[in-house]
């Protein structure tokens, strides 16, 4: 389906405020340290050129391709070579080189101060003075910040903060009506940062076939009374919808997405019951609510696999007729029957299958050799679910906080290499799990722990790939994307690390420590823990309690003294040298 | 298991069409591959057309662009929409499935079959 003018086409299937808000998306996306007003022009004059083109496809430029105008387009920034550095070097490139380039620059933990939240009366001026550039402004920081946050998502996000101040700059009280809202978005709009880094990440590293096996498995749970030719047909479809946005196609991916919510919802009775009511709404909540529609209920009466995966004839011609059909179809009918399944393990499953026949169809006696193979499943099932069970129980028995830390030591342990910030980081993360995922009933406690897990690792390895300093961190992000937590579940404590010299200075507290919010406390006591771990990494769980609650005992000492700082001044090497004596 | 019963035969003037459909029932046989076969009187069996998992056909030469199979997964059905019908397409047809990617051409390789329907063609 080609088109005169893409610019063109574009525009006029997405409409001028989408077409707008993509474009900022995908510029701040690239140019991450550009100002907020450079970005405004920039977009402005691609919107205005795009109106040429649509008034006259023919026009001057309105045959270049996306990539070619866009990345022109960027290439006009005067401070390229000062801000940037070798990222300008894209610029002496030609199309596809030049936009694999900008994407490969592209900064998962970039040097950016965390955004402040203003007082509401202030936000709520700026809204109401100027909307459009208080929306736009939302959507640079949230895109410049998360490089690979899913675009056409970002605008539903976006279409959510403005009705939150629609309705709330007008309430009695506003800050009680827009605070919760604004800390849901922001929390919300993480995990579907992180959600989406896994899918980009899926892509990127382990290829389409990665991500077409994780989507058949998880459309097939979502969907599980569709055929399975409706399941690869939606997982073609949503695999160029990633593929386009994680390559910074965003006009396509969103026009595409799109296309695929008019699909579903034109094809709902041979798809799922459940997409109804996603249905009626517009398109951005259109597309969010499908995304994350509920799995519709199993059809009764699934017959056992066996019969076609392991007792049938032609369990091995269909395998070498077509290897990955089979495989998927296996997929499919493992995951519509196992909603109660992560979808790593579904993968890991679906891998023994392949493993098992790659060397049986080989073998004398092939039906001899596969007979067994499903139960081969169960140590690769019980693994997960013995793992959610231990890690719940220790999360009820400790609390979000402490579960937290006996993860931040465990981790530290693991990886001691691993960047202080980033361990942190990572383990507060996983120690999240314990609260979003322990609650819930058993058939839905590993899909959602494990799964989770899978999303902040790979945050892990994404940030490690940009500073790489351990070989176990490597091998577990770049050997298996299925495997990653078990790799990661299985490492021990780093014997060949050698513990990092005490430094007085990352134990020395402040009377600011005093002024901190709750969470902002925690991350300093938990900073200081990975240190300890860092410099006594063989200190037992009873020794590192010690400290620690000897930590917080300090901490609100000198937080209720008349002089704090003079408290802390003093105390400090007190609790530093009688925490050295407990680790002696 | 699987067991297939055919419908839709019957007598029919040259030129004229009818309709077979095959009802599957025991497990949804979407995945599977479906066939349909011919015998008349006094010959083998022979291949008509065939029908996977996507919905991708084969035909037989003598009856390509007369005859379409096609399949409905939500009744679990398979058909054989038979147009400009001959004399010599007088024969039972039957019904048959088998759990394969790639569909067969060879009644050997089905694993279940229909009891056949009748069709005559009369000039």
């Known amino acids: 389906d080609t088109h005169k003018s893409e610019v063109a086409h574009r525009f006029k299937d997405l409409g001028e405020e989408h077409f707008k808000g993509l474009v900022l998306v995908a510029f701040s996306q690239y140019l991450q340290q550009c100002p907020f007003e450079e970005h405004v022009k920039l977009v402005n004059e691609v919107t205005e050129f795009a109106k040429t083109c649509v008034a006259d496809e023919s026009a001057e430029n309105c045959d270049k391709s996306l990539h070619t105008l866009f990345g022109d387009k960027l290439c006009t920034v005067a401070t390229l070579r000062e801000t940037y550095g070798e990222m300008a070097d894209c610029c002496a490139k030609q199309e596809p080189e030049r936009n694999e380039c900008f994407l490969q620059h592209k900064d998962d933990n970039p040097n950016l101060p965390p955004l402040v939240r203003p007082e509401v009366d202030v936000m709520c001026t700026a809204f109401h003075d100027n909307e459009a550039t208080f929306l736009k402004k939302y959507l640079y920081e949230v895109a410049r910040r998360h490089p690979y946050f899913y675009a056409p998502e970002l605008l539903f996000f976006a279409a959510r903060y403005k009705a939150a101040f629609a309705e709330c700059c007008q309430a009695a009280d506003k800050a009680a009506c827009l605070l919760p809202k604004l800390d849901e978005l922001r929390d919300e709009g993480k995990a579907s940062s992180a959600k989406q880094r896994l899918k980009c990440a899926s892509l990127q590293k382990f290829g389409d076939r990665a991500f077409k096996a994780w989507a058949v498995a998880r459309l097939s749970q979502k969907f599980p009374k569709a055929e399975f030719a409706e399941v690869s047909k939606l997982v073609t479809d949503l695999t160029k919808v990633h593929t386009e946005c994680c390559h910074g196609d965003l006009l396509e991916c969103a026009d595409d997405r799109a296309d695929l919510a008019k699909y579903m919802c034109e094809n709902q009775d041979s798809i799922s019951s459940k997409l109804k009511e996603c249905c009626d709404k517009p398109l951005l909540e259109k597309s969010h609510c499908l995304a994350e529609v509920e799995n519709d209920e199993m059809p009764a009466d699934l017959p056992s696999l066996a019969a076609d995966y392991v007792e049938s004839k032609d369990v091995c011609k269909n395998y070498a007729e077509a290897k990955d059909v089979f495989l998927g179809m296996f997929l499919y009918e493992y995951a519509r029957r196992h909603p109660d399944y992560s979808v790593m393990l579904l993968l890991r499953l679906a891998k023994a299958y392949e493993a098992t026949l790659e060397k049986c169809c080989a073998a004398a006696d092939p039906h001899e050799c596969y007979a067994k193979v499903f139960d081969e499943f169960q140590p690769l099932v019980e693994e997960p679910q013995n793992l959610v069970k231990q890690n719940c129980e220790l999360f009820e028995q400790l609390g979000e906080y402490k579960f937290q830390n006996a993860l931040l030591v465990r981790y530290t342990k693991k990886v001691p290499q691993v960047s202080t910030p980033t361990l942190v980081e990572v383990s507060r993360n996983l120690g999240k799990v314990g609260a979003k995922c322990c609650k819930l009933p058993e058939a839905k406690r590993m899909p959602c722990a494990e799964d989770y897990l899978s999303v902040v690792l790979n945050r892990l390895c994404v940030l490690h790939e940009k500073t790489p300093v351990s070989e176990k961190v490597t091998k577990c992000c770049t050997e298996s994307l299925v495997n990653r937590r078990p790799c990661f579940s299985a490492l021990e404590l780093d014997e060949a690390y050698v513990p990092k010299a005490f430094n007085a200075e990352t134990f020395t507290f402040h009377a600011d420590m005093c002024t901190l919010s709750e969470k902002e406390k925690q991350v300093k006591k938990q900073t200081a823990l990975v240190e300890l771990v860092k410099h006594k990494p063989k200190a037992t769980k009873e020794q590192l309690k010690g400290v620690m609650d000897n930590f917080a005992a300090f901490v609100e000492k000198c937080c209720k003294a008349d002089d704090k700082e003079a408290c802390f001044a003093e105390e400090g090497p007190k609790f530093v040298a009688a925490s050295q004596a407990a680790l002696a | 298991q699987v067991q297939l019963n055919e419908s839709g035969g019957g007598m029919v003037q040259a030129g004229g069409s009818l309709r077979l459909s095959c009802a599957a029932s025991?497990?949804?046989?979407?995945?599977?591959?479906a066939g349909w076969f011919r015998q008349a009187p006094g010959k083998e069996r022979e291949f008509v057309a065939a029908?996977?998992?996507?919905?991708?056909?084969t035909y037989a030469d003598s009856v390509k662009g007369r005859f379409i199979i096609s399949r409905e997964y939500a009744k679990n059905t398979v058909a054989l929409q038979m147009n400009s019908l001959k004399p010599e397409d007088t024969a039972v047809y039957y019904c048959?499935?088998?759990?394969?990617?790639?569909?067969?051409?060879?009644?050997?390789?089905?694993?279940?079959w229909g009891q056949g329907t009748q069709v005559t063609v009369s000039s």
């Open positions: 048959a499935a088998v759990f394969r990617i790639v569909a067969p051409k060879t009644q050997y390789e089905y694993d279940y």
């Open positions: 029908i996977n998992w996507n919905k991708t056909t």
């Open positions: 025991g497990r949804t046989v979407s995945n599977y591959a």
